[in-house]
Amino acid sequence: FVRTKIDTTENLLNTEVHSSPAQRWSMQVPPEVSAEAGDAAVLPCTFTHPHRHYDGPLTAIWRAGEPYAGPQVFRCAAARGSELCQTALSLHGRFRLLGNPRRNDLSLRVERLALADDRRYFCRVEFAGDVHDRYESRHGVRLHVTAAPRIVNISVLPSPAHAFRALCTAEGEPPPALAWSGPALGNSLAAVRSPREGHGHLVTAELPALTHDGRYTCTAANSLGRSEASVYLFRFHGASGAST
């Protein structure tokens, strides 16, 4: 028989889980795991199942984004009787199985984290052989990636009536606070835009009117650090252009 179930118990167990006759399918994952960009994270996932001493072929799968339909980021398969789960897919070569699926452990290591990895992940196990059965975590584990600020773009743009404006875009998690400093400015938070839709870690600050020539510095700061970048405005007086 083929059966797909969803789990109701998703608490992180610290002990290794072993199957017993009365056990049902369940998966244990923590609600959230946090790690810094550039570092590694572990996504824990253990499971119980009703098929005592199952020794047949199995496949371990991790998806991102949503259960059942989300794209696979990792997949491995273990042959009958084998403790080795042979990796068949590892997105960008950054996902590595830590756990032993034969011991009901699908825990995954994610290397070289980026802010784009900040999403929900779902573990799944499939049995094939004498027993055909499968089970997938429904709620999954949220990977929360934190990052010190990084200024991704700083520029000076023309605006109407021969004026100029400056834009500074930074990324980070928590989203950084941006401040401009420059000639006759002091320190100014200057029209900070909220994180853009679909770009949750990006923040933009605009200086709408640059009134003086000179160096304008954007500083991005959050609890993990700060970053700054500068642009220079030199207008050719009597002409309509500017050098930046």
């Epitope: 992180l12 610290n14 923590p30 795991v33 790690a35 570092d39 590694a40 994270a41 572990v42 996504l43 824990p44 080795l84 042979q86 990796t87 068949a88 897919l89 590892s90 070569g93 590595r96 199985l97 830590l98 756990g99 825990s107 290591r109």
Partner: antibody, heavy 121, light 110 residues
Framework: EVQIVESGGGLVQPGGSLRLSCATS????????MNWVRQAPEKGLEWVAQ??????????FYAESLEGRVTISRDDSESSVYLQMSSLRAEDTAVYYC????????????WGQGTLVTVSS | DIVLTQSPALAVSLGERATISCRAS??????????IHWYQQKPGQQPRLLIY???NLASGIPARFSGSGSGTDFTLTISSLQAEDVATYFC????????TFAGGTKLEIK
């Protein structure tokens, strides 16, 4: 039975080059990462380099102290791994071990018997 | 780089418990997984994996060997020392590249 056999060690002058080879058998070579670890005489162990398998795009990693002077490579058809060393220095004198590691763990579950590299004039 | 520190030598009587410690310069544990591994090296031989990820016994290793610890402090225990356990023991971390080893602890019979 897992077997790992290194060769290619010997006496080389400072500034010289050497290519170490590691032949393996008894396991499915394609499923594993391979590494070189060295041990200077009467000293501790130092990881040198790692090469991952095809699924992991044959990615290579090196100890900073050796980067630029060593290159790790593998030949899946021959179940072999190599370490090309150049600009050798006296402090590179060591026994070089070829080791195997699982794709999920950067620990070394099988080791060869090692090959001695001596850098001296 | 993560620096691992072990005491250089230890002398224990046959049949007694031997405890070898390893300290890391920063935590090597993520989400309950500790990336510390233990090796045994006898004179003139290559190292042999004993324990992986702090507490898992490697294949073919006698049950008198065990590992424990979390964060920065780890211990390899031999419950009842045998003559064949005379060797140097190394811990290694794989929390962050480059993978590093401690200097080793030489275990002798008292």
């Amino acid at each position: 039975e897992v077997q790992i056999v290194e060769s290619g060690g010997g006496l080389v002058q400072p500034g010289g080059s050497l290519r170490l080879s590691c032949a393996t058998s008894g396991f499915n070579f394609n499923d594993y990462f391979m590494n070189w670890v060295r041990q200077a005489p009467e000293k501790g162990l130092e990881w040198v380099a790692q090469i991952r398998n095809k699924i992991y795009t044959y990615a290579t990693f090196y100890a900073e102290s050796l980067e630029g002077r060593v290159t790790i490579s593998r030949d899946d058809s021959e179940s072999s791994v190599y370490l090309q060393m150049s600009s050798l220095r006296a402090e590179d004198t060591a026994v070089y071990y070829c080791t195997r590691s699982l794709t999920g763990g950067d620990y070394f579950d099988y080791w060869g018997q090692g090959t001695l590299v001596t850098v001296s004039s | 780089d993560i620096v691992l520190t072990q005491s250089p030598a230890l002398a224990v009587s046959l049949g007694e418990r031997a405890t070898i410690s390893c300290r890391a310069s920063q935590s090597v544990t993520i989400s309950g997984y500790s990336f510390i591994h233990w090796y045994q090296q006898k004179p003139g031989q290559q190292p042999r994996l004993l324990i992986y990820r702090a507490s898992n016994l490697a294949s073919g290793i006698p049950a008198r060997f065990s590992g424990s610890g979390s964060g920065t402090d780890f211990t390899l225990t031999i419950s009842s020392l045998q003559a064949e356990d005379v060797a140097t023991y190394f811990c290694q971390q794989s929390r962050k590249s480059p993978w590093t080893f401690a200097g080793g602890t030489k275990l002798e019979i008292k």
